[in-house]
């Protein structure tokens, strides 16, 4: 019958388990005809054979290690061997089998971990391959760490990501780990697959020689410093310290400054040397370094910030000895006359330079006091009261007050009454012709004069003459300057010329006075001129489609895995190679022709995200020019921290003996991120042994009750495991020690005699 | 060895029917193809159809549907194939053509040749 | 239906000359092409196939060359023997066709 196992000539999938030796046909194909053969190609390996009626079949067993899909393809022949339907694909997917061991790429691997590293920050990865498929349990595999050796006091110091392999510290291994009592450690690492769950699971272990050392070179805190101190100088504001002594300190001043009032000593402490004035500049960053004796760096150098904090120390400042308006005599009550703006260097938006307006004398005083209003915020002169007359007073002067919160100043206005404007600007020519020009011309650059005369008063907002580009120059790339005493216009280059997007622009210009027109008089075609640019091409840099190209992947992706990708164009359309700039974790690469982004290690979002590494675009050919855009990666968290205690928990008792069964609460986390609900942990004791004397309790998803089972302890510390699991997929499983002592008590704290101080309990229970 | 022996020349009169024969030795006469070819003097071949003895399948050029039929006896090894409504435009010689493909081969050739069968139609 | 083209229908040549024969698909017909040849008052006879195998038995003198809509039969050393009807043939699709022939004569 038709259906699982025969029918028509159609692109089909078979799913084949590897190792199988061939039970049943695949699938017998009809003819349609004229066809009365069948014919198949592809990826047969002499092991997939189609008989002359259509019948599919294999003849050995696969191997998904070899081939993991064999893509094939069958066809229908005529009886003259001639295709008449297809080929169609047939794919065959071998499914896996547990059929190969993981195995370690090193029998031994060593390393080295600064002392208070931080926990969960890999220093080392161990690695095993296993050819089995990732996408199945069979090639998923499940680190774990077996022994460490020391153990002090049960309690791991070190922790392994069961996915990755990244070995890092915990928590406890953060806060304890002194190479001074211990310098090395050794773990024992095995490597599961079937992803660690099942007893049919093949393994390979391996060893990891672990060096401790110090470390103390941390970047400080910012530090905000108020400008113009009047305490004596040098100040210290904050300090750097090398690992070791005998380093050599100096500061880098980044920013090349004129002067640079900060100095180190040589024990590391740093100074301000001088007082510092924010209105001159408002924030430091620089750089400590620490050399040895050949002036070598020791390691990366630490970043200093400092932040000036504003004072009042500046009044407001007028924009000119005299600022002068113009009003007509025409003109209506309300109208703008004109805005003053005055200035305060101290920093924006900040009481320190909030300013206050108010007009405090009016001369003279003609018809009457109080012609003029200015907006108490705005500064914004207005008409308060009537027309004015020029033939009685053709100019007023204000004396107006601007104030912020500590100082007061005076700013002095000179508002002129002009004729009425009822002549209209008239340009000399109405073409200026065709002007060619490199697209490279340097900003600022005058490109043409051109010429309006206005009939009405001189030198009055009347006869003023704005010129302003109506049409031709969307993008803003030129602008025309006015000689305010023959009112020409130089035409100047504001932005870059662009050959790519306008090559040729039919520019017109309009020429308008200030002051409006009166009413009836209106601006006609002798007010307007045209030109046209024409710009020739340069070689210019690539530019990239965005200034920021950001991608989100998950922490767990495969080595090789395509995270993101770039693009830029070259307006000369030449090719262009990609290339990255500042991975400093190594992380990344770029195709060089394409601009796709792909893994290369391991990525973590605990050690930071979003993670930013610069893309650089170059020009094949050429003259080589490139341009810089930022990749911004955003990791999505996986479950890949095992949980551990959420605090020192040392120093827990109970009084010795105990009168009744007691408990204590101790609180779980995990370095993973837990959105919405938070973390759902789940407890239980960490070995079998332990059942008879503890007892373990969940609260709630982070909190759980360690209660006695009985009162009848030794008077001794007893370490208490315990099993901590994320419940995550997958799972992650943390064991942790719990240090409990049962100790006599004086006045409800344990009680030690003389000489035995070390590492006194402080809670008791 | 192979060979394709074809029958004699005919004359016909407009409107009757012709039946050539192609009768073939020397191979399995159900593994290959037999094709017809029209060549009137002067002129390039036709290709008329085939017929597989096999499945009897048989297939035509859309020019001579209706003209041509294609028939073959398993059990003498011969072909035939039947012109029917004569005019005098089918005045050719026609030949039987073997073509060498069988499955599994790569032999895409007319390999063996009738003598060809002179038909006339005359009144 | 795809067309072939032999746009010569007759070719003078001398014994000894290299003689190329042209043929040309009105569409590509990739190299499902075969060459044969016809001498007066007998059957077609094979030379070529898929564009350029030679036949077995065929002189290595024939040679055929090309791909998609352009083949020749190029005659290296002609032999008076060799004067003949020439045809190609296309089976890439159905109808299956021939050429119109070009006929090879001495000068």
């Known amino acids: 019958q038709e259906g699982k196992f025969s029918g028509p000539l159609k692109p089909m999938t078979f799913s084949i388990y590897e190792g199988q030796e061939p039970s049943q046909i695949i699938f017998q194909f009809k003819a349609n005809p004229p066809a009365v053969t069948f014919e198949l190609t592809g990826e047969t390996d002499n092991i997939f054979v189609i008989e002359r009626e259509g019948l599919l079949y294999y003849n050995r067993a696969l191997d998904r290690e070899t081939r993991s899909t064999h893509n094939l393809q069958v066809a229908a022949l005529d009886a003259n061997g001639i295709i008449v339907e297809g080929p169609v694909p047939i794919t065959i997917k071998v499914k896996d089998i547990n059929d190969n061991r993981p195995t370690f790429l090193q029998s031994k691997y060593e390393g080295s971990v600064r002392q208070n590293s931080r926990p969960g920050k890999p220093f080392l990865y161990v690695n095993a391959t296993d050819l089995d498929d990732p996408a199945t349990p069979n090639g998923q595999l499940y680190y774990q760490i077996v022994i460490q050796l020391p153990m002090i006091n049960n309690v791991m110091y070190f922790q392994i990501n069961n996915k990755t392999g990244a070995i890092s510290l915990t928590r406890e291994g953060s806060q304890e780990l002194n190479p001074a009592k211990n310098p090395s450690y050794n773990l024992v690492i095995s490597v599961k697959d079937m992803g660690g769950q099942s007893e049919n699971s093949f393994s390979d272990t391996t060893s990891v020689d672990i060096i401790v050392t110090e470390n103390i070179w941390k970047a400080p805190k910012p530090v905000e410093m108020v400008e113009n101190s009047t305490d004596p100088h040098p100040i210290k504001i904050t300090q750097v310290r090398w690992n070791d002594p005998g380093a050599q300190y100096s500061l880098v001043d980044k920013e090349k400054l004129p002067r640079f009032p900060f100095s180190i000593d040589q024990e590391g402490d740093i100074y301000v040397t001088q007082p510092l004035d924010r209105e001159e500049k408002d924030a430091y960053v620089f750089y400590a370094v620490a050399k040895d004796e050949y002036g070598k760096p020791l390691s990366y150098p630490l970043e200093i910030h400092v932040k000036v904090k504003d004072i009042n120390d500046n009044p407001p400042t007028c924009p000119s000895p005299v600022t002068v308006f113009e009003v007509q005599e025409n003109e209506r009550l309300g109208n703008s006359i004109g805005t003053l703006t005055a200035h305060d260097r101290d920093e924006e938006n900040t009481a320190n330079s909030f300013l206050n307006y108010r007009i405090v004398e009016q001369t003279p005083k003609l018809p009457m006091d109080g012609l003029f209003l200015i907006q108490t915020y705005a500064g914004m002169l207005q008409l308060a009261k009537q027309s004015l007359k020029k033939q009685d007073t053709p100019q007023y002067n204000l004396t107006i007050e601007v104030s912020d919160k500590d100082f007061k100043t005076l700013c002095f206005v000179q508002i002129n009454v002009i004729d009425i404007n009822d002549q209209i600007p008239i340009f000399e020519k109405s073409d200026y012709g065709n002007l060619t020009l490199a697209e490279d011309t340097n900003i600022g650059s005058t490109i043409l004069t051109i010429q309006a005369t206005d009939a009405d008063e001189p030198f009055t907002g009347s006869s003023k003459i704005l010129y302003h580009i109506i049409k031709g120059d969307s993008e803003g790339r030129l602008g025309v300057d006015t000689d305010p005493h023959t009112n020409t216009g130089y035409v100047i280059i504001k932005k870059p010329l662009d050959f790519e997007t306008a090559a040729v622009s039919n520019i017109v210009f309009k020429a308008e006075n200030p002051e409006p027109l009166v009413f009836g008089v209106k601006y006609n075609a002798s007010s307007f001129a045209k030109f046209t640019l024409i710009v020739t091409d340069v070689n210019e840099a690539p530019q990239f489609s965005q200034h920021v190209f950001q991608a989100k992947v998950s922490e767990d992706v495969a080595i090789g895995t395509k995270v993101g990708n770039v693009t830029a164009k070259d307006p000369e359309g030449l090719d262009i190679s990609y290339s990255l700039r500042g991975d400093t974790r190594g992380w990344l690469k770029i195709d060089h022709v394409t601009g796709e982004i792909f893994s290369v290690a391991p990525l973590d979002r605990e050690a930071g995200s979003p993670y930013r590494v610069q893309v650089v675009a170059t020009e094949v050919g050429g003259s080589s020019l490139s341009s810089v855009s930022e990749f911004h990666l955003i990791l999505m968290d996986v479950n890949d921290n095992p949980p551990r205690l959420a605090k020192d928990y040392t120093g827990l008792f109970f009084c010795h003996p105990l009168s009744a069964p007691g408990s204590l609460i101790f609180e779980a986390t995990d370095d993973d991120q837990h959105l919405f609900r938070g973390p759902h942990f789940t407890f239980s004791l960490g070995s079998g042994s332990l059942q008879n004397d503890w007892e373990v309790s969940k609260i709630n998803g982070t909190h759980a009750r360690l209660s006695t089972r009985h009162t009848e302890f030794e008077e001794r510390e007893y370490v208490v495991l315990i099993r901590i699991n994320d419940g995550g997929r997958p799972p992650l499983e943390g064991i942790v020690s719990l240090p409990v002592t049962f100790c006599s008590c004086v006045e409800g704290s344990c009680f030690r005699p003389a000489g035995h101080q070390t590492g006194i309990p402080t809670v008791g229970m | 060895q192979v060979q394709l022996v074809q029958s004699g020349a005919e004359v016909k009169k407009p409107g009757s029917s012709v039946k050539v024969s192609c009768k073939v030795s020397?191979?399995?006469?159900?593994?290959?193809?037999i094709h017809w070819m029209k060549q009137r003097p002067g002129q390039g071949l036709e290709w008329i159809g085939y017929i597989y003895p096999r499945d009897v399948i048989t297939q035509y050029n859309e020019k001579f549907k209706g003209k041509v039929t294609l028939t073959a006896d398993k059990s003498t090894s011969t072909a035939y194939m039947e012109l029917s409504s004569l005019r005098s435009e089918d005045t050719a010689v026609y030949l039987c053509?073997?073509?060498?493909?069988?499955?599994?081969?790569?032999?895409?050739?007319?390999?063996?040749w009738g003598q060809g069968t002179t038909v006339t139609v005359s009144s | 239906d795809i067309v072939m083209t032999q746009s010569q229908k007759f070719m003078s040549t001398t014994v000894g000359d290299r003689v190329n024969i042209t043929c040309k698909a009105s569409?590509?017909?990739?190299?499902?092409v075969a060459w044969y040849q016809q001498k007066p008052g007998q059957s077609p006879k094979l030379l070529i196939y898929?564009?350029?195998n030679r036949y077995t038995g065929v002189p290595d003198r024939f040679t055929g060359s090309g791909s998609g809509t352009d083949f020749t039969l190029t005659i290296t050393n002609m032999q008076s023997k060799d004067l003949a009807d020439y045809f190609c043939q296309q089976y890439s699709s159905y109808p299956w066709t021939f050429g119109g022939g070009t006929k090879l004569e001495i000068k």
């Open positions: 020397g191979y399995t006469f159900t593994d290959h193809t």
């Open positions: 898929s564009a350029s």
């Open positions: 053509a073997r073509w060498g493909y069988f499955y599994g081969s790569r032999s895409y050739y007319f390999d063996y």
């Open positions: 569409q590509n017909v990739g190299t499902a």
